[in-house]
Interface confidence: low
């Protein structure tokens, strides 16, 4: 007898994992055999859709590989023309193990800013997201929060926030871990210990100490009077993100030394500066005490000027007289490279004989100053133009180095050779004028260089000598 369709096994909710098989069963009793159709969310499932398999006269619907988009309400409808059509519906709940769809990435951030490490997830049930820092679960606090999206937000990033992070997505079906990422906190360069100012004696050593920190560890550069440090030795060490730089200087002139700590943040730099002055004690006062000893000149600069195996006065007020005096001459010598050919040999002779004065040995070794007449010959004849220019520069504060003050004698304070011929030293390089010998007595020289013309007498000279400083 004809029998209207009856669905004997109503559809139930089916849970299925992605990529697994899901089957709905719609058992129907009827006569004649019914036609059974299937819908998903009220849209007909086509028989030829290869993602589905419909068997047992349409009573079994199999989804061959579940996708998360298969989620929805599935209904079967049976109709055999006898009575009305019958329908039963059930839900497909696509269960999904957690999946991290937007993993976190390495982040570099400057201390004090806000950092966000992304972690977007999928899964059913919806995964909960937590974070691990290093090996431990990250605890949320006033600065740290896991957002609804799963991302980690850190306000006012601190150095201690740096480290390795990973996010963890978890639901009843499993757990997913992101790859480990690095949060690097960069810190502007900062000076922890500034160099200290020093007041020292000429020719002594000074060590300027500068300590800085920052992330990345800063580099330290030293500036001397606005230029890169040209001499001295720099010792550096780095420990625990602190760079320690020591500049050891051999002091021959006062200076302003600046320690500059620099580090780089992307394309930008941060710098910190600290400065110290090195002044020279008694710099402006002539040295009154002749403390020192006689020794053969063993330097290089004055080899061509001083007599062979000359006995010179070495001043023990310097830490290392030989090298202090050599360095003094060396620096001043370089400044003579630009003077006129007439002036240069005379100035070199004056410089070397003034810094490395002839020495009279004895119970108390005594330096023998240059005779005033020779000094005036250099000043008022050979180098008049240059001497005047130098004194003008000195008055106007234009001299780059104050070191020349120690290497230029004050002629007016030197003894005259007419007072006591043995009390002062002559400059063999400035030989007397043979046509007009009244100014200087004859002298012998193994290295004649320039004839001295007729000198104006020192008493009638209209050239005023501004006070400079003498080494002795």
């Amino acid at each position: 007898l004809p029998k209207a369709p009856v669905i004997t096994t109503p559809l139930e909710t089916v849970d299925a994992l992605v990529e697994e098989v899901a089957t709905f069963m719609c058992a129907v009793e009827s006569y004649p055999q019914p036609e059974i159709s299937w819908t998903r969310n009220k849209i007909l499932i086509k028989l030829f859709d290869t993602r589905y398999s419909i068997r047992e006269n349409g009573q079994l619907l199999t989804i061959l590989s579940v996708e998360d988009s298969d989620d929805g309400i599935y209904c079967c409808t049976a109709n055999n023309g006898v009575g009305g059509a019958v329908e039963s519906c059930g839900a497909l709940q696509v269960k999904m193990k957690p999946k991290i769809t937007r993993p976190p990435i390495n982040v570099k951030i400057i201390e004090g800013l806000k950092a966000v490490l992304p972690c977007t997830t999928m899964g059913n049930p919806k995964p909960s997201v937590s974070w691990i820092k290093g090996d431990s679960p990250l605890r949320e606090n006033s600065r740290t929060a896991v957002l609804e999206s799963g991302s980690l937000r850190i306000h006012n990033v601190q150095k201690e926030d740096a480290g390795q992070y990973r996010c963890v997505a978890k639901n009843s079906l499993g757990t997913a871990y992101s790859k480990v990422v690095k949060l690097e906190v960069e810190v502007f360069a900062r000076i922890l210990r500034a160099p200290e100012s020093h007041n020292v004696t000429f020719g002594s050593f000074v060590t300027l100490h500068c300590t800085a920190t920052g992330i990345p560890v800063p580099t330290i550069t030293w500036i001397e009077n606005g230029n890169a440090v040209s001499s001295g030795s720099i010792q550096e060490s780095v420990k625990d993100r602190v760079i320690d730089s020591r500049l050891q200087l051999f002091i021959t002139k006062p200076g302003l030394y600046t320690c500059i700590a620099t580090n780089k943040h992307g394309e930008k730099f941060s710098t910190a500066k600290a400065a110290a002055t090195v002044s020279i004690a008694e710099w402006s006062k002539p040295q009154k005490d002749n403390k020192g000893y006689c020794a053969q000149y063993r330097g290089e600069v004055c080899n061509a000027v001083l007599a062979k195996d000359a006995l010179v006065f070495l001043n023990t007020s310097y830490a290392d007289p030989e090298e202090a005096q050599e360095l003094l001459v060396h620096t001043a010598w370089n400044e003579l490279k630009v003077v006129s050919p007439l002036c240069r040999p005379a100035a070199e002779a004056l410089l070397c004989n003034h810094v490395f004065q002839e020495c009279s040995p004895g119970v108390v070794p005594t330096p023998i100053p240059i005779c005033r007449e020779y000094c005036l010959a250099v000043k008022e004849l050979f180098c008049a133009k240059e001497w005047l220019a130098m004194e003008e520069k000195t008055h106007r504060g234009l001299y780059r180095s104050e070191m020349h003050l120690l290497s230029v004698p004050e002629c007016s304070k030197l003894p005259s050779m007419h007072w006591d011929p043995t009390a002062c030293a002559r400059l063999p390089h400035l030989d007397y004028n043979k046509e007009n010998p009244k100014t200087f007595p004859p002298m012998t020289s193994s290295k004649p260089s320039v004839d001295i013309p007729n000198l104006p007498s020192s008493s009638s000279s209209s050239f005023s000598v501004s006070p400079t400083y003498s080494m002795t």
Partner: antibody
Amino acid sequence: ELQLVESGGGLVQPGGSLRLSCAASGFTFDDYGMSWVRQAPGKGLEWVSAIPWNGGSTYYKESVKGRFTISRDNAKKTLYLQMNSLKSEDTAVYYCAKRSGRIAFGALDAWGQGTLVTVSS
Amino acid sequence: QAVVTQEPSLSVSPGGTVTLTCGLSSGSVTASNYPDWYQQTPGQAPRGLIYSTDSRHSGVPSRFSGSISGNKAALTITGAQPEDEADYYCALYMYSDSKLYVFGGGTKLTVL
């Protein structure tokens, strides 16, 4: 990389001569003072000689004065120690060392590996 | 001629603190002697540790420190490590006409 490489050591009879060389690289040689330091087998360090950056002066331990000569060729970045009238007590490993600054004396902040000089008949 | 004196040997436990001293047979060590300290392990060239009394050479751990205490220079190792077992030499700049740089006899430090 800063390197100091000594050479020229060897076996020599008493009264003989040797010339040690120290080739420098990795730093501005003519900005620094240099020294020779020696170490007799099983003994401590002994400073021998020093020279400032410009070679303008030379310094020696009293016992080697007149027999040893320190010199430098800044163009070749090489330090030398000419040793004459050698005695058995000069037997030692000779180290070349760099000063931390220009003058001849003070901290030695880099050392070579040394070259052995043996004075024996 | 003044002799630079050092303890022939000292020992320290790992993590402990030890002070090596450097004196003069006649007179006191002062800052103008610019005391320097060197470390030498067997078969190796010496290595600079401290220069000019208290400045550390580049790369030297902060556990090494230098000072002048009383009439001697001192090298202090705070928190000694096994790798600190070595010979330690001090050297003094002896300003005189002959300009000498004099090493002490060395201290053999054992880290027990």
